[in-house]
């Protein structure tokens, strides 16, 4: 999906209002310095591409993020403010359902959500030069 035509300011507002709080809740009890940010993004569409991938695509050691509260709200925000997004996700969801495991917060999941927090922070500061 090409995120170029999304309403970035509304997605940012939804993130600041509630999605960010849900990410913090998920990470509660984890030190902010515990994980190094290894995933980066260069502009808002690229950030949303990476956010969508890390949130909804199962990875080795972490197959359960798609059912978390922050994921549900992220899906809603992208569907509402990115034209045509929900229509593109049908195949992705079927694959996700097959890969879904029991909902367990593993260290790998915590690391992945830490990466997500970094991507969202970068999404909110699009004018900053890439480090």
């Amino acid at each position: 999906y090409d995120f170029t035509n999304c309403d970035f300011e509304k997605i940012k507002a939804a993130y600041l209002s509630t999605i960010s709080k849900d990410l913090i809740t998920y990470m509660s009890g984890t030190k902010s310095t515990e994980f190094n940010n290894t995933v980066s993004c260069s502009n808002r569409p690229h950030c949303l591409t990476e956010i969508q991938s890390l949130t909804f695509n199962p990875t080795a050691g972490c197959a359960s993020l798609a059912k978390e509260m922050f994921a549900m709200k992220t899906k809603a925000a992208l569907a509402i403010w990115c034209p045509g997004y929900s229509e593109t996700q049908i195949n992705a969801t079927q694959a996700m359902k097959k890969a879904r495991k029991s909902k367990v917060t593993t260290n790998k999941c915590l690391e992945q959500v830490s990466q997500l927090q970094g991507l969202w922070r970068r999404f909110n500061r699009p004018l900053l030069k890439q480090q």
């Epitope: 209002s17 509630t18 899906k75 569907a79 509402i80 929900s86 079927q94």
Partner: antibody, heavy 122, light 108 residues
Framework: EVQLVQSGAEVKKPGESLKISCKSS????????INWVRQMPGKGLEWMGQ????????TYNGNFKGQVTISADKSISTAYLQWSSLKASDTAMYYC???????????????WGQGTTVTVSS | EIVMTQSPATLSVSPGERATLSCSVS???????LHWYQQKPGQSPRPWIF???NLASGIPARFSGSGSGTEFTLTISSLQSEDFAVYYC?????????FGGGTKVEIK
């Protein structure tokens, strides 16, 4: 104008099957989660589960998982709640509710259907 | 599961008086994930307050919400006849979504 219109009241016998509906209009149906909420006579509200019509993704309250099935038909902008074998304890009012971001970007159930009364009695 | 406990179950108030409704949450949640709904007999619930303190569209300013963590409050500064109803708090912090048992505000 956003509207959720639910199917009419139902009277059923224990063991029978039932499918009630919630037809949406006035917004992009595929892009918003639809929730189902139960209210037993004289009692409070209980969240049963939700569906994202865009891809059919569902999340259930564990208390209702296996008891009901939530589905949706995008082509007619309608969500469904169904039972394969009703019990007397399923007697209740059932509401569908859309969830979305309000003007302050808080996420909540912002529009509700009028409710469907289901009575199960022998 | 997050348990929402509302008190009192019934609040008897005279028109013009102040009403304070409480919602206690079993584990701390973000204020952005606490909402209030109003329900009148024979009607569907209506969104009333979003994110602890933000009034839904068209809700009069005599209503206010406050709180954080595990304790939240809905206050009606001067009750009008149309305010008599049941009010439910609800959390959108973790699954399953849960509602409080409701507080019925009735005429004294």
């Amino acid at each position: 104008e956003v509207q959720l219109v639910q199917s009419g009241a139902e009277v059923k016998k224990p063991g029978e099957s039932l499918k009630i509906s919630c037809k949406s209009s006035g917004y992009a149906f595929s892009s918003y989660w639809i929730n189902w909420v139960r209210q037993m006579p004289g009692k409070g509200l209980e969240w049963m589960g939700q569906i994202f019509p865009g891809d059919g993704d569902t999340t259930y309250n564990g208390n209702f998982k296996g008891q009901v099935t939530i589905s949706a038909d995008k082509s007619i902008s309608t969500a469904y709640l169904q039972w394969s074998s009703l019990k007397a304890s399923d007697t209740a009012m059932y509401y569908c509710a859309r969830s979305g971001f309000d003007y302050g970007y808080f996420y909540a159930m912002d529009y509700w259907g009028q409710g469907t009364t289901v009575t199960v009695s022998s | 599961e997050i348990v929402m406990t509302q008190s009192p179950a019934t609040l008897s108030v005279s028109p013009g008086e102040r009403a304070t409704l409480s919602c206690s949450v079993s584990s701390s949640i973000s204020s952005s994930n606490l909402h209030w709904y109003q329900q009148k007999p024979g009607q569907s619930p209506r969104p009333w307050i979003f994110g602890t303190s933000n009034l839904a569209s068209g809700i009069p300013a005599r209503f206010s919400g406050s709180g954080s963590g595990t304790e939240f409050t809905l206050t009606i500064s001067s009750l009008q006849s149309e305010d008599f109803a049941v009010y439910y708090c609800q959390q959108w912090s973790s699954y399953p979504l849960t509602f409080g048992g409701g507080t019925k505000v009735e005429i004294k």
